[in-house]
Interface confidence: low
C-alpha cells in the first residue's frame, strides 16, 4: 500500500547473468556431395553471446553458409535480382539488398537463372528458411542465474536478489519457490503464456521484469524482488515485417593460406532484464 509519510526513491540496479546447459544438435551435413546426419554438442560458449546492458542471448536455431572466400560470384537470385544481359548489372553498384559490389556482368547462378556477378564473400548466402523444428530446441531446459544488485543511495541501502540462505540447486517457481533466482528458460516462456518450441524457430525477445517494492522502515522492513515475464517482440510473425530475432556472425579460418569463413545466421531469444521499483523510508 502507498505510504504517504515515506520518502520514495527509484531503484538503481546492476544485473549479471550466467546461462548453463548443453544441447545436442543433429543436422544434415553435406560432404563431397554426400549428405549424412551430423551430431554436435553445443555448450555455453557456442550458444550465448555477451550483450551490452541488461540482456543476454541464447541461440536456438541457425543457418550456415560454409567455406566462403572473398572472390567474384553470382549473387543470390532473390526476387528482382535476376538478369538476362550485362545491361542489367551496373559496375561498382552496391545494392543494399545484395551481398557485394557488382562487377557489371550477368552470369549463370544455376541451370535456369542468371544474376549479376558481385565481388563478395562467395558463394553468397542463400535465402534459406530457418530449420523447423529449431536445431537447439532443447535450450528450453537451459537455466539462467540472474544476479541483481540494487541500491537506494538516498536511503544508503544496498541489497541483492540472492540471499545467503539460497540453495544453488533451486529452480524458480511462481508458487513453490518465488525467490529462487535460477530460471529454466522453458518456464519463463510458460509463465509468459508463450510456446518456446515455436518461438525458438525464428527467435524473439523476452522480458524478465524484476520489481522491487521496498519498505525500508526498520519496524516493517521488506525488500524482496517480484519476478514476472512477458514477450516483448511482435509475436504475429506472419504480419510483422521482419519476424523473430536474428543476427549474423562469422568464424574465420585459413585453408591452403586462403582466408575463409563460415557465416552463421543465428536465431534465438534475447532476454531483456527490466529492473524497476522504489524504496520508501520515513
Amino acid at each position: 500500500s502507498d505510504k504517504l509519510y515515506q520518502r520514495k526513491e527509484p531503484v538503481i540496479s546492476s544485473v549479471h547473468t550466467k546461462v548453463k546447459g548443453i544441447a545436442e544438435v543433429t543436422e544434415n551435413v553435406t560432404e563431397g556431395g554426400v549428405t549424412k546426419l551430423g551430431h554436435s554438442i553445443f555448450d555455453t560458449a557456442d550458444y550465448t553471446f555477451p550483450l551490452q546492458g541488461n540482456s543476454f542471448f541464447v541461440m536456438t536455431n541457425y543457418v550456415k553458409s560454409e567455406g566462403q572466400v572473398q572472390t567474384l560470384c553470382p549473387e543470390y537470385p532473390r526476387r528482382g535480382a535476376q538478369c538476362s544481359s550485362d545491361r542489367r548489372c551496373k559496375k561498382g553498384w552496391m545494392d543494399p539488398q545484395s551481398k557485394g559490389i557488382q562487377t557489371g556482368r550477368c552470369v549463370p547462378y544455376d541451370k535456369t537463372r542468371k544474376t549479376c556477378e558481385v565481388s563478395a564473400w562467395c558463394p553468397t548466402e542463400e535465402e534459406k528458411e530457418a530449420p523447423r523444428p529449431a536445431l537447439l530446441r532443447s535450450a528450453e531446459n537451459f537455466t539462467v542465474l540472474i544476479k541483481n544488485n540494487i541500491h537506494f543511495p538516498g536511503h544508503n541501502y544496498t541489497t541483492r536478489n540472492i540471499l545467503p540462505t539460497m540453495n544453488g540447486s533451486c529452480t524458480f517457481h511462481k508458487t513453490w519457490d518465488p525467490q529462487c533466482s535460477i530460471f529454466r528458460l522453458g518456464d519463463i516462456f510458460q509463465e509468459a503464456g508463450e510456446n518456446f518450441t515455436e518461438v525458438a524457430v525464428q527467435g524473439g525477445i523476452m522480458g524478465i521484469e524484476i520489481y522491487w517494492d521496498c519498505n525500508l522502515d526498520s519496524w516493517s522492513h521488506h525488500c524482496r524482488p517480484r519476478y514476472s515475464f512477458r514477450r516483448l517482440d511482435d509475436k504475429n510473425t506472419d504480419e510483422s515485417f521482419v519476424p523473430g530475432y536474428n543476427f549474423r556472425y562469422a568464424k574465420y579460418y585459413k585453408e591452403n593460406n586462403v582466408e575463409k569463413r563460415t557465416l552463421i545466421k543465428a536465431f534465438g531469444i534475447r532476454f531483456d532484464i527490466l529492473v524497476f521499483g522504489t524504496g520508501g523510508k520515513f
Partner: nanobody, 126 residues
Amino acid sequence: EVQLVESGGGLVQAGGSLRLSCAASGRTFSSSPVGWFRQAPGKERDFVATISWNGVDTHYLDSVKGRFTISRDNALNTVHLQMHILKPEDTALYYCAASTSGSAYLPYRVYQYDSWGQGTQVTVSS
C-alpha cells in the same frame, strides 16, 4: 586429367565465319562443362562461351551473343565454337578449357577451369 587440343583458327575478313574445334581425351570430359576463352595481346584472358556437361545449357559473353554458337558432341569428345559476322575486335588467341572439378554448372571464370588447351589464333582483318 583431360587433354585438350584446339583447331580451326586462321585469318578471315571482317563479316566472315570460322568454326573452332576442341578435341579432348580423358574419361571425365563428357561430365565436365567446357568453355572458350580468348586473349588478345597485352590483355587478360576473357570468357567467350560455356556449355554444360550435357550440352543442354549455354552462356555467352554479351558481345558475341547471336554471332557465336557453342555446341558439343560427347560421343566424339569434341566441343565446337561456330563464329559468324566476325569483327576485328574478335582477333585473339582462342583457348578451350574444361572444368573437371564440378564447382559450377556453367563456369565462366578462368579460375573455375582446371584443364586448358594450347590455343588457336583467330585474326580478323578489316
